[in-house]
Interface confidence: low
């Protein structure tokens, strides 16, 4: 059972906006009341819902881990987007942690791609141009990051 399938019950603050459900569902940015008669807005910066839903609560906003930067803050309809900080990247195989980018290419190889928040540096052989992705001893420190599509939010 995922975190989202076991839905907590959150009590609505008095100032939260309310409307009526449509066909038993509430719009993004809202959750349903316990008697299913009202849609209650999520609390900005605290929780959110991205789809039409019948949740008894809004999903809690992700807090970025240390080693991550907040690219987009949480709104009532979108979770926080976290990105690895400069000099680190998130691998597809282990998306839960930011790994340090290699600081340079081994001898006989040249860097063709800088470190980004979602990929390590890329090295190719000077002559053949074939890629090399293994861990290597550092020979030069060239670490740059460029903004781009952030990794999927961690929750």
């Amino acid at each position: 059972i995922t975190r989202q399938s076991l839905d907590p019950q959150r009590r609505a603050a008095p100032q939260q906006k309310r409307s009526s459900p449509t066909e038993g569902l509430c719009p993004p940015g809202h959750h349903i009341s316990e008697d299913s008669r009202e849609c209650i807005s999520c609390k900005y910066g605290q929780d959110y819902s991205t789809h039409w839903n019948d949740f008894l609560f809004c999903l809690r906003c992700t807090k970025c881990d240390s080693g991550e930067v907040e690219v987009n803050s949480c709104t009532t309809t979108r979770n926080t987007v976290c990105q690895c900080e400069e000099g680190t990247f998130r691998e597809e195989d282990s998306p839960e942690i930011c790994r340090k980018c290699r600081t340079g290419c081994p001898r006989g190889m040249v860097k063709v791609k800088d470190c980004t928040p979602w990929s390590d540096i890329e090295c190719v052989h000077k002559e053949s141009g074939t890629k090399h992705t293994g861990e290597v001893p550092a020979v030069e420190k060239t670490v740059t990051t460029s903004p781009g599509t952030p990794a999927s939010p961690c929750s």
Partner: antibody, heavy 121, light 118 residues
């Protein structure tokens, strides 16, 4: 007095079908969500399916999705569970339960006595 | 690992107080959940005992005496059912549950068998 009475259980072969019914009385049936919960012999409780007060929204446990259908007839104060493609692991006592959804509790506050479904060749 | 963990069995003497535990898996936060408790005596259907969200937001099941009470330990991610003045008829299986979707109401724990020693 709230009463829920299940019927329709019995012995069925694997792959077969069965339709369970639950007759409700003692409360305004059309204003409450209803559920089916099962209990395999000597085991714990497993929520099976739920339906909202009007019958518009239906929900199923992953283990029965695509095989079981929950429905209700508010004019007859009745809840149903159509069970198709039955498997040995569906063998259990099936309880009909009321969702206290007109209050803030949202608990399964009243239960029937249960009906036994046995799937065996 | 189940979402809700309950010890399989507990026992206590007649007239004493016992506290049954329901531990929520640590990728969930019990602070934002209501905890439900059900009692099932042998050969009987389950009976709703109580719901506990907080001291100011809780409810007792129909005809359930106040010697059954709920509580939570948010730091330990646990819900509790306390039964005071244990009686022979309290010998039963006790299931905790957590609210799920607005209609898909419950995820049940595996249950704790309570034995009342005379």
């Amino acid at each position: 007095e709230v009463q829920l009475v299940e019927s329709g259980g019995g012995l069925v072969k694997p792959g077969g079908s069965l339709r369970l019914s639950c007759a409700a009385s003692g409360f305004t049936f059309s204003t409450y969500g209803m559920h089916w919960v099962r209990q395999a012999p000597g085991k714990g409780l497993e929520w099976v399916a739920g339906i909202n007060y009007s019958g518009n929204n239906k929900y199923y446990a992953d283990s029965v999705k695509g095989r079981f259908t929950i429905s209700r007839d508010n004019a007859k104060n009745s809840l149903y569970l159509q069970m198709n493609s039955l498997r040995a692991e569906d063998t259990a006592v099936y309880y009909c339960a009321r969702d206290s959804s007109t209050t803030r509790t949202r608990a399964l506050d009243y239960w029937g006595q249960g009906t036994l479904v046995t799937v065996s060749s | 690992q189940p979402v809700l963990h309950q010890p399989p069995a507990m026992s206590s003497a007649l007239g004493t107080t016992i506290r049954l535990t329901c531990t929520l898996r640590n990728d969930h936060d019990i602070g934002v959940y209501s905890v439900y408790w059900y009692q099932q005596r042998p050969g009987h259907p389950p009976r709703f005992l109580l719901r506990y969200f907080s001291q100011s937001d809780k409810s007792q099941g129909p005809q359930v005496p106040p010697r059954f009470s709920g509580s939570k330990d948010v730091a330990r991610n646990r819900g509790y059912l306390s039964i005071s003045e244990l009686q022979p008829e309290d010998e039963a299986m006790y299931y905790c549950a957590m609210g799920a979707r607005s209609s898909v109401t419950h995820v049940f724990g595996s249950g704790t068998q309570l034995t009342v020693l005379s």
